[in-house]
């Protein structure tokens, strides 16, 4: 089960439903972006491979005071089996590359859409 209860969903949901909702939230962010997202904050780029949900959360959790990505942070925490806190980094970060949050969200969205189309929900 994908348990996102208490974060964004009304309770446990199938993995495909959780991924579908995460994609829609990222679409929301990209569509509604007017001013630079999170004031142009920079985050570590990640390898979009196995374990990317935790890596994405580890990267985005270091952005504070940005309400536009708070829901995304909560949703990603539902995909990550361990607790993530600011300053935590995994080997999946490309530690020599920082990108704007807006670009990070776009890259993540493109990859998640690909996974969804290919039926990779877990």
């Amino acid at each position: 089960l994908t348990c996102l209860g208490g974060f964004a969903s009304p309770g446990p949901v199938p993995p495909s439903t959780a991924l579908r909702e995460l994609i829609e939230e990222l679409v929301n962010i990209t569509q509604n972006q007017k001013a630079p997202l999170c004031n142009g904050s920079m985050v570590w780029s990640i390898n979009l491979t196995a374990g990317m949900y935790c890596a994405a959360l580890e990267s985005l959790i270091n952005v504070s005071g940005c309400s536009a990505i708070e829901k995304t942070q909560r949703m990603l925490s539902g995909f990550c089996p361990h607790k993530v806190s600011a300053g935590q980094f995994s080997s999946l970060h490309v530690r020599d590359t920082k990108i704007e949050v807006a670009q990070f969200v776009k890259d993540l969205l493109l990859h998640l859409k690909k996974l969804f189309r290919e039926g990779q929900f877990n």
Partner: antibody
Framework: EVQLQESGPGLVKPSETLSLTCTVS????????WNWIRQPPGKGLEYIGY???????YYNPSLKSQITISRDTSKNQLSLKLSSVTAADTAVYYC????????????WGQGTTVTVSS | DIQMTQSPSSLSASVGDRVTITCHAS??????LSWYQQKPGKAPKLLIY???DLHTGVPSRFSGSGSGTDFTLTISSLQPEDFATYYC?????????FGGGTKVEIK
């Protein structure tokens, strides 16, 4: 109460493009997910795909090359285009709602019958 | 795609009978299964979701059970309005798939 009403041509010639419309009343297509499902005569149900409240789409891979789902928010309508149709596309076509965070179809239109024949 | 197999494909029963329909998934779908009722010339209607949760307004004579790969829809006491075709649907992964249907006919 949300209601769905499908409309379409009824008869389409082989190799042509089938165009169907689903009008949503009592609710907004700018919320939830709006799906197309079809049922060939005397057979079971086949999932076609959806358009989301954001306008994002998903198509069943088995039909992907044929399908386009779009929407007109000003008219509160979604549409299905199915290209290069054959007799195998003869079916009753339903639109159905799927609420956010769910995976079951709680509201259905009454369906529209499409026959592919020359 | 996940294949959904229903059995039997049809059955004959009398008013008042207890009727059981089964649905088998080709892989584990946890409890992400719903049941629909369809009458001739009409759209399907949602009866049960999450394997056993009754949709709003559905009579309590309908019940669902199961998890993993095997599921059951039970009508405890068949009523005249229950003669219809019943379909299961999995929500574990896209594309969503339906069973082939079980037609409940009057004996």
């Amino acid at each position: 109460e949300v209601q769905l009403q499908e409309s379409g041509p009824g008869l389409v010639k082989p190799s042509e493009t089938l165009s169907l419309t689903c009008t949503v009343s009592g609710g907004s297509i700018s919320s939830d997910y709006w799906n197309w499902i079809r049922q060939p005569p005397g057979k079971g149900l086949e999932y076609i795909g959806y358009i989301s409240y954001n306008g994002n789409t998903y198509y069943n891979p088995s039909l992907k090359s044929q399908i386009t789902i779009s929407r007109d928010t000003s008219k509160n309508q979604l549409s299905l285009k199915l290209s290069s149709v054959t007799a195998a596309d003869t079916a009753v076509y339903y639109c159905a709602r799927l609420a956010k965070w769910t995976w079951y179809f709680d509201i259905w239109g009454q369906g529209t019958t499409v026959t592919v024949s020359s | 795609d996940i294949q959904m197999t229903q059995s039997p494909s049809s059955l004959s029963a009398s008013v008042g009978d207890r009727v059981t329909i089964t649905c088998h998934a080709s892989q584990n779908i946890n409890v992400w299964l719903s049941w629909y009722q369809q009458k001739p010339g009409k759209a399907p209607k949602l009866l049960i979701y999450k394997a056993s949760d009754l949709h709003t307004g559905v009579p309590s004579r309908f019940s669902g059970s199961g998890s993993g790969t095997d599921f059951t829809l039970t009508i405890s006491s068949l009523q005249p309005e229950d003669f219809a075709t019943y379909y299961c649907q999995q929500g574990q992964s896209y594309p969503y798939t339906f069973g082939g249907g079980t037609k409940v006919e009057i004996k």
